[in-house]
């Protein structure tokens, strides 16, 4: 939510996803003030004691900052003056998944707004076709997932075919025994069709689709996280 | 343009102490984490800790905790390592090194020309 | 404490030849690992970060990739000067570990 009226200002934040393992950013803006030194920036997250990162008279103020945060936060200093408090988080955790708070103070007045940070595990999924096999096989492999994903295959010619008959997933735990490779493989699959391989957990949603003809064969995958609303 | 100029070589003997200076310029010292690594002759890169000097938090190699202590002096942008009880295995050069990131600790981007620390009786 | 394992401790190669170094990180995934270049006598320099992200200044035939805990550094044509030390550094966690080095020598 947005708070605005008299002493106060407007704070943006947007509803976002971590991959594990990798950066996060926890987007908030406000409305800018003509001078660094008079922007405070607060970051809290609900449950946790000390703050996750705070900002102020132009430089990082680390002294009430919480020990699971030390070292992993950063604003974009050069950006604040412009109005943004977003903050970068290092080598995002499951246990960052929470409620945050975008705490803002500057000569206008002061305002905040709550933001829902999920985190998991979400990659972009590769489909080739699958020359090993016997039969005409489309194999759609991502390496990182979490939560455990459902995967549903479908075609441009055939909308709204099922193929759960004719495809097999399995999930085959990584390494770090947190995240998953997922690999679906389609049977059956004729030319000059195009196939959809789409994975989807409740962060993230991602697509590939391959083009067989009997000239070519085209290739497109994109990645989109679910749930990225604004307050 | 961001620069470590380090203390000259030392001479110790065991069972001494010694300290190192790491004086920063070209960049706000306040608002970037600081390390310190090592390298015995011939030998690869050791990571002894790093210290915030905007605040004085550290972390340290385990191997190193209760010898090494790291500290800054904010009015003349300088980190320090402390080394105790020193044995002829600490001969080494020792580093000094930005962490790029600012208060997010990354990568370190910036180092100074290493200092000689040479333990002997 | 997570371990870095750097292979090969050294490598013979010529110049134009293509080089991989590989670290493998003990336990844990995440992207912080950085390439360092050393010469003797002179201070780690900074090649490669967040895995794949090249330092400014670096030349375009160093890379970086990797993902879990498996990770390479490679140099796609070996130039005279590319002959050094070369260090991957894990930098995600609370304790920093660098691999033990891959000596690159004129073969």
């Known amino acids: 939510f947005g708070i605005s009226g008299r002493h106060s200002i407007t704070v943006t934040t947007v509803a976002s996803a971590g991959n594990i393992g990798e950066d996060g950013i926890l987007s908030c803006t406000f409305e800018p003030d003509i001078k660094l030194s008079d922007i405070v920036i607060q970051w809290l997250k609900e449950g946790v004691i000390g703050l996750v990162h705070e900002f102020k008279e132009g430089k990082d103020e680390l002294s009430e900052q919480d020990e699971m945060f030390r070292g992993r936060t950063a604003v974009f200093a050069d950006q604040v003056i412009v109005g943004n408090a977003s903050l970068r988080l290092k080598n995002v955790q499951l246990t960052d998944a929470g409620t945050y708070k975008c705490y803002i103070i500057t000569s206008k007045g002061k305002g905040n707004a709550n933001l829902e940070y999920k985190t998991g595990a979400f990659s972009m999924p590769e489909v080739n076709v699958d020359y090993n096999a016997s039969s005409e096989t489309l194999r759609c492999e991502a390496p990182r997932w979490f939560p455990q994903p459902t995967v549903v295959w479908a075609s441009q010619v055939d909308q709204g075919a099922n193929f759960s008959e004719v495809s097999n997933t399995s999930f085959e735990l990584n390494s770090e025994n947190v995240t998953m490779k997922v690999v679906s493989v389609l049977y059956n699959v004729t030319i000059n069709n195009t196939y959809s391989c789409m994975i989807e957990n409740d962060i993230a949603k991602a697509t590939g689709d391959i083009k067989v003809t009997e000239s070519e064969i085209k290739r497109r995958s994109h990645l989109q996280l679910l749930n990225s609303k604004a307050s | 343009e961001v620069q470590l100029v380090q203390s000259g070589a030392e001479v110790k003997k065991p069972g001494a102490s010694v300290k190192v200076s790491c004086k920063a310029s070209?960049?706000?010292?306040?608002?970037?984490?600081i390390g310190w690594v090592r390298q015995a002759p011939g030998q690869g890169l050791e990571w002894i800790g790093d210290?915030?000097?905007?605040?004085?938090?550290?972390n340290y190699n385990e191997k190193f905790k209760g010898r090494a202590t790291l500290t800054r002096d904010t009015s003349t942008s300088t980190a320090y390592l402390e080394l105790s009880s020193l044995r002829s295995e600490d001969t080494a050069v020792y580093y000094c090194?930005?962490?790029?990131?600012?208060?997010?600790?990354?990568?370190?981007?910036?180092w100074g020309q290493g200092t000689l620390v040479t333990v002997s009786s | 404490d997570i371990q870095m394992t750097q292979s090969p401790s050294s490598l013979s190669a010529s110049v134009g030849d293509r080089v991989t170094i590989t670290c493998k990180a003990s336990?844990?995934?995440?992207?912080?690992v950085a390439w360092y270049q050393q010469k003797p006598g002179k201070a780690p320099k900074l090649l490669i970060y967040?895995?794949?992200t090249l330092q400014p200044g670096v030349p375009s035939r160093f890379s970086g990739s990797g993902s879990g805990r498996d990770y390479t550094l490679t140099i796609s044509s070996l130039q005279p000067e590319d002959f050094a030390t070369y260090y991957c550094?894990?930098?995600?966690?609370?304790?920093?570990?660098f691999g033990q080095g891959t000596k690159v020598e004129i073969k």
């Open positions: 090194a930005r962490l790029d990131g600012s208060s997010y600790r990354g990568a370190m981007d910036s």
């Open positions: 070209g960049y706000t010292f306040t608002s970037y984490w």
């Open positions: 210290i915030y000097p905007g605040g004085g938090y550290t």
């Open positions: 336990q844990g995934f995440n992207k912080y």
């Open positions: 967040y895995t794949s």
């Open positions: 550094l894990q930098y995600g966690n609370l304790l920093y570990a």
